[in-house]
């Protein structure tokens, strides 16, 4: 017993006078309390508690249910224990099987034995599996068996507690060991698509996926700069021990103008956070943007290739697309295709393949598309560059050389006159009239040019030449003239290519 | 004898929260998992959630997560459970139960919480 | 989660009959051979009492007319011979993962 000074309350003493008691099954627990100020007994087993008011604790047929610690209190709060053991061969254990771990803890096996005097107390496999090498244990007969620095790996473990009594060992009931994993991470997150576009009226439901060892991790969506609770649906899963999935589903069933914006999918556990967002757009109407990916005025020399292509937005998704020319539907000749795969994806691109345009080819091209809501149109203008072509070359009634030239761009028209048989006309003759004529063909055809000069200021034999010419190339035709006395004769023009 | 008391019956409003306590006594209150189990009226059991022992981890059901809190006061063996953003799904009876030998063993006798406008 | 599902809903009896509820879960409650599937009593405006515990063991104090069996996904709750205090709900519960779950109930009502 504790020894105490003089005047100050001093703890209750117990008879008997030992801390620990061993009785047999079905004989007499007599346990006196002495105190003044005696207060209560309390009975201790597997951390439930009983009390007695009396001073004498008496249980006539122990039980091994009675093994335990006797605490006797005063009314100073002072006490003193004793632990009786109810040696019962039938029953070596108390058991509480609940048995929890925390990742990196020490965690209790509560199985304290009725008998301090059996040996080799500790902890066995079932179905006489070993235990895990690293797997350390402190045996205590009167709590139980402290494993430590429990791991990941022992979840589902199945133990007894074991002992030998008179040479055999005895095993208890089965303790299935089940281990919260500490967390070593930040969840991981992810979403079903990174933006959605909807029109009003239609649902909008996006899933969150998050993925971390046990369920105890918190999630939830929440919306960008508002307080809002969002509805959420959760499915979840266990793939196998620390491998827990949830998907967290929101869904807004008639989405409105106004819940546009961002979404947020949080996740945190007692390591950290971890989001993801999605953003969501909601179009009162559908539309379809198109943006030409070359001018819309073209120029293409005769006989080369053009590309006309255009890349549109369209939501909701394009129904119809065609590329006309001179009320003349394309049946072929172009492609149509998204500009990606990604589900998500609202952008096209459409080709219109032009080749070995001619020169009666230019014109306005127009591609259309449609969907659901609206429909939309582009035009392109396309102006084929032609080398000018000599239409016609005429000495007229009246005197005049007349030389008309055809092309794209607007050819100029250039005169020389060559004396006698030289072959090089470098004297350059003034034009008299020059015209630009309206063209029978459509408007993005050729232009024409006439000029005119008067025949009556060449003197001498020789050569007249007309000179077409613009960007592409150039034509020249020749009048050839020779003088008989005083009368001049036109001999049958020609045209000569000069490239 | 393992005895759990809870607190009296509650009428809240919709949006508000409630905390209900649960006073254990009869057993070493650190060496427990402490579970909460609501009651829908005329509807079944449902398991809101655990607070462990020792360590006073928490594991809830995702169906309340970021709504409810359990926590423990070791200094008077008395365990609460709070929920807030009450809606009128929430009125129940609210169960405290004792995890003792792998089952719930002991049980609070039950607070009601209305919830109504 | 693990679902369990109760069969009856609801039943009508005798005293003196004997009566027979199952419980099916989604997924096995078995870890090595130890089922976490428990039997709960349920009267109305009281607590749930525990009848059986672990599938097959009698709580202490509950009489031994009522019984508990199965393994894995299939579980059992038989009263032999009913009494007049045996009219109740009946809950199944599992604890093998979280978040435990319980079963819809089995009303048993006097016939």
């Known amino acids: 017993q504790p020894s105490v000074s003089p005047g100050e309350p001093s703890p209750p003493s117990i008879h008997p006078g030992k801390s620990d008691l061993i009785v047999r099954v079905g004989d007499e627990i007599r346990l006196l309390c002495t105190d003044p100020g005696f207060v209560k007994w309390t009975f201790e087993i597997l951390d439930e508690t009983n009390e007695n008011k009396q001073n004498e604790w008496i249980t006539e047929k122990a039980e091994a249910t009675n093994t335990g610690k006797y605490t006797c209190t005063n009314k100073h709060g002072l006490s003193n224990s004793i632990y009786v053991f109810v040696r019962d061969p039938a029953k070596l254990f108390l058991v509480d099987r609940s048995l929890y771990g925390k990742e990196d803890n020490d965690t209790l096996v509560r199985c304290p034995l009725t008998d301090p005097e059996v040996t080799n107390y500790s902890l066995k496999g079932c179905q006489g599996k070993p235990l895990p090498k690293d797997l350390r244990f402190i045996p205590d007969p009167k709590a139980g068996i402290m494993i430590k620095s429990v791991k990941r790996a022992y979840h589902r473990l199945c133990l007894h507690c074991s002992v030998d009594q008179e040479g055999k060992s005895v095993l208890s009931e089965k303790f299935i060991l089940k281990v919260r994993p500490a967390f070593k991470a930040v969840p991981v997150v992810s979403v079903s698509k990174a933006s959605y576009l909807l029109r009003e009226g239609e649902e909008f439901t996006v899933t969150c996926t998050i993925k971390d060892v046990s369920s105890s991790v918190y999630s939830t969506w929440k919306r960008e700069n508002s307080q809002t609770k969002l509805q959420e649906k959760y499915n979840s899963w266990h793939h196998g021990d620390f491998n827990y999935e949830r998907q967290a589903t929101l869904t807004i069933s008639s989405a409105r103008v106004n819940d546009s914006g961002v979404f947020m999918c949080y996740a945190n556990n007692t390591f950290g956070s971890a989001n993801v967002t999605t953003t969501l757009e909601v179009v009162d109407k559908g539309f379809i943007n198109i943006f030409p990916m070359i001018n819309t005025t073209v120029f293409v020399n005769d006989g080369e290739n053009v590309d006309l292509i255009v890349e549109y937005e369209a939501f909701p998704k394009p129904e119809h697309q065609q590329w006309i020319y001179m009320n003349r539907t394309f049946t072929d000749k172009w492609e149509d295709y998204p500009k990606s795969e990604n589900e998500s994806n609202i952008r096209y691109v459409s080709e219109l393949h032009l080749t070995r345009l001619k020169g009666t080819e230019g014109g306005t091209y127009t591609f259309l598309v449609s969907n659901s809501d609206v429909n939309a149109a582009i035009a392109f203008n396309v102006y084929v560059n032609t080398k000018p072509e000599i239409l016609t070359y005429d000495r007229l009634v009246n005197g005049m050389l007349q030389c008309v030239a055809a092309g794209f761009p607007e050819p100029t028209i250039d005169w020389y006159f060559c004396p006698g048989t030289e072959q090089r006309c470098s004297a350059s003759v003034l034009p008299v009239d020059v015209q630009t004529l309206n063209s029978s063909g459509p408007p993005f055809g050729k232009l024409v040019v006439q000029s005119s000069i008067d025949s009556s200021a060449f003197k001498h034999n020789g050569t007249v030449e007309c000179k077409a010419y613009n960007d592409v190339g150039k034509t020249s035709a020749y009048f050839n003239f020779a003088f008989k006395g005083n009368n001049k004769e036109q001999i049958h023009p020609h045209t000569l290519f000069t490239p | 004898q393992v005895q759990l008391v809870q607190s009296g019956a509650e009428v809240k409003k919709p949006g508000a929260s409630v905390k209900v306590s649960c006073k254990a006594s009869g057993y070493t209150f650190t060496s427990y998992n402490m579970h909460w189990v609501r009651q829908a009226p005329g509807q079944g059991l449902e398991w809101m959630g655990v607070i462990y022992s020792g360590s006073g981890d928490t594991s809830y059901n995702q169906k309340f997560k970021g709504r409810v809190t359990m926590t423990t006061d070791t200094s008077t063996s008395t365990a609460y459970m709070e929920l807030r953003s009450l809606t009128s799904d929430d009125t129940a009876v609210y169960y405290c139960?004792?995890?003792?030998?792998?089952?719930?063993?002991?049980w609070g006798q039950g607070t009601l919480v209305t919830v109504s406008a | 989660e693990i679902v369990l599902t109760q069969s009856p809903s609801s039943l009508s009896a005798s005293v003196g009959d004997r009566v027979t509820i199952t419980c099916r879960a989604s997924?096995?409650?078995?870890?090595?051979?130890?089922?976490?599937m428990h039997w709960y009593q349920q009267k109305p405006g009281k607590a749930p009492k525990l009848l059986i515990y672990?599938?097959?063991n009698l709580e202490s104090g509950v009489p031994s007319r009522f019984s508990g069996s199965g393994s894995g996904t299939d579980f059992t709750l038989t009263i032999s011979s009913l009494q007049p205090e045996d009219f109740a709900t009946y809950y199944c519960q599992q604890n093998n993962e979280e978040p435990y779950t319980f079963g819809q109930g089995t009303k048993l009502e006097i016939k």
């Open positions: 672990l599938a097959s």
């Open positions: 139960a004792r995890e003792r030998d792998t089952r719930f063993g002991n």
């Open positions: 997924e096995s409650v078995d870890i090595y051979g130890e089922s976490f």
